[in-house]
């Protein structure tokens, strides 16, 4: 990238923002005020929700967003057109499907309209941030006597992009039994007595085919096997398919 | 990239460089400056993005300016108020299109604060 | 700002061995996170973004990785050639900030 050098001619650019020495100490001060950090979730593919924390700013102040993606052709940005407001004050921005676009670096800047020079921008991979929805109609049924398998539906189109992680414990047991299931949607657990009641949640994530998303879905409504025969609860609670 | 500057600058007094580049347009990719005090590290100052908008290295925001003219493919970096610790090699770096961080360098131009 | 801390500001390994250089954020940076090398009296050069992309023609034996705050460049079969700065930078949120350097001497 070799280039003859030439010097500045006095014509530059004046959509970037002026300068003058004669600021005010006061301006200064507030615009080297540092803008709270953006956290953006996808949440099932389906939308976005980005939000900062506008307690934060030292005075009530509606921060504007915008956003863009960076790719070869062009990087336009542009201003969120659907605010969400705490006590009156922007704090976040609800974007639609048709705005997400997981595998392009997604740009968003975070800027106080009273004082152009403070701004933020950062980037962020929006297929590590894809929250999917609990898994949904989870099922237990008999493979043996003593082996039961799990199944659950995702809410998610395409299944091979999550893992998920399911726990299960008997009313014997104080903690959680885990363990992670890669790309399917069952699970099967050898050895279980007919004596004890277990509980069965699940939980999926983004992850690692299709993204690296860290952030877990809620936790499916519970399914129980079994029979709790102490004389407390003498109640039964069977799911069977 | 090609970065061209005074070289030698009175304390008090400011400091202007120019990134000259070629092979891409100013409207498609951002331009970062960094510089690098003799025998010390990488330090950011800030970029112009491809959009115009602008970010400076928060301690350096009430002396920084940096501005272009996308006609004639120039980067200006203004630094007001110099002192001896602004004595550095000061570069200007592409940001990639695909690339997110600084993909190509200047070879830098050398800035001594010094009466 | 976030402050990105490399604990080692000098390293030493011998041609053909691997070795190791670390860099921590202040805060989770979600993997934005670039390594440069800085050969003597060059300008700094790309080697690694979003913590694991190679950028192009840059050897494979050099390889990135981490997440949240802690990121590594793994530089394996080291090569002569490969004495040099090594620095780390997140690209996650402005103002951009680099870890302040370590120095590759080769034995």
């Known amino acids: 990238l070799n280039s003859t050098v030439l010097k500045p001619s006095g014509n530059e650019d004046t959509t970037a923002d002026s300068f003058s020495t004669s600021e005010t100490l006061e301006s200064l001060n507030i615009s080297t005020l540092p803008l709270p950090e953006v956290q953006c979730f996808v949440f099932n593919g389906e939308y976005m929700n980005c939000t900062w924390n506008s307690s934060s700013e030292p005075q009530p102040t509606n921060l504007t967003l915008q956003y863009g993606y960076k790719n070869s052709d062009n990087y336009k940005v542009q201003e969120c057109g659907h605010y969400k407001f705490s006590k009156e004050i922007t704090s976040g921005c609800w974007l639609p499907k048709s705005e997400i676009r997981l595998y392009e670096t997604f740009v968003v800047r975070l800027q106080d309209p009273r004082e152009p020079r403070r701004q933020m921008e950062q980037k962020l991979k929006l297929q590590n941030l894809v929250i999917p929805w609990a898994p949904e109609n989870l099922t237990l049924r008999n493979l043996s006597e003593s082996q039961l398998e799990l199944s659950w539906k995702n809410r998610y189109a395409l299944d091979h992009c999550l893992q998920h992680l399911v726990q299960y414990r008997s009313d014997w047991d104080s903690n959680w039994t885990e363990q992670q299931v890669d790309h399917k949607q069952s699970f099967s657990l050898p050895s279980v007595d007919g004596q004890k009641l277990y509980t069965f949640r699940v939980r999926s994530r983004f992850n690692p085919l299709c993204g690296s998303a860290q952030h877990w879905s809620k936790w499916s409504h519970p399914v129980y096997w079994g029979s709790n025969i102490s004389k407390e609860n003498p109640w039964l609670f069977i799911t069977k398919a | 990239l090609q970065e061209s500057g005074p070289g030698l600058v009175a304390p008090s007094q400011s400091l202007s460089i120019t990134c000259t580049v070629s092979?891409?347009?100013?409207?498609?990719?951002?331009v970062h400056w960094v510089r690098q005090p003799p025998g010390k590290g990488l330090e950011w100052l800030g970029v112009i993005w491809a959009g115009g908008s602008t970010n400076y290295n928060s301690a350096l925001m009430s002396r920084l300016n940096i501005n272009r003219d996308n006609s004639k493919s120039q980067i200006f970096l203004k630094m007001n108020s110099l002192q001896t610790d602004d004595t550095a090699i000061y570069y200007c770096a592409r940001e990639g299109s695909t690339v997110d961080s600084m993909d190509y360098w200047g070879q830098g131009t050398t800035v001594t604060v010094s009466s | 700002d976030i402050v990105m801390t490399q604990s080692h500001k000098f390293m030493s390994t011998s041609v053909g061995d691997s070795i190791t250089i670390t860099c921590k954020a202040s805060q989770d940076v979600t993997t934005a996170v670039a390594w440069y090398q800085q050969k003597p009296g060059q300008s700094p050069k790309l080697l690694i973004y979003w913590a694991s992309t190679r950028h192009t023609g840059v050897p494979d034996r050099f390889t990135g990785s981490g997440s949240g705050t802690d990121y590594t460049l793994t530089i394996s079969s080291v090569q002569a050639e490969d004495l040099a700065l090594y620095y780390c930078q997140q690209h996650y949120i402005t103002p951009w900030t680099f870890g302040g350097g370590t120095k590759l001497e080769i034995k």
């Open positions: 092979g891409f347009s100013l409207t498609s990719y951002g």
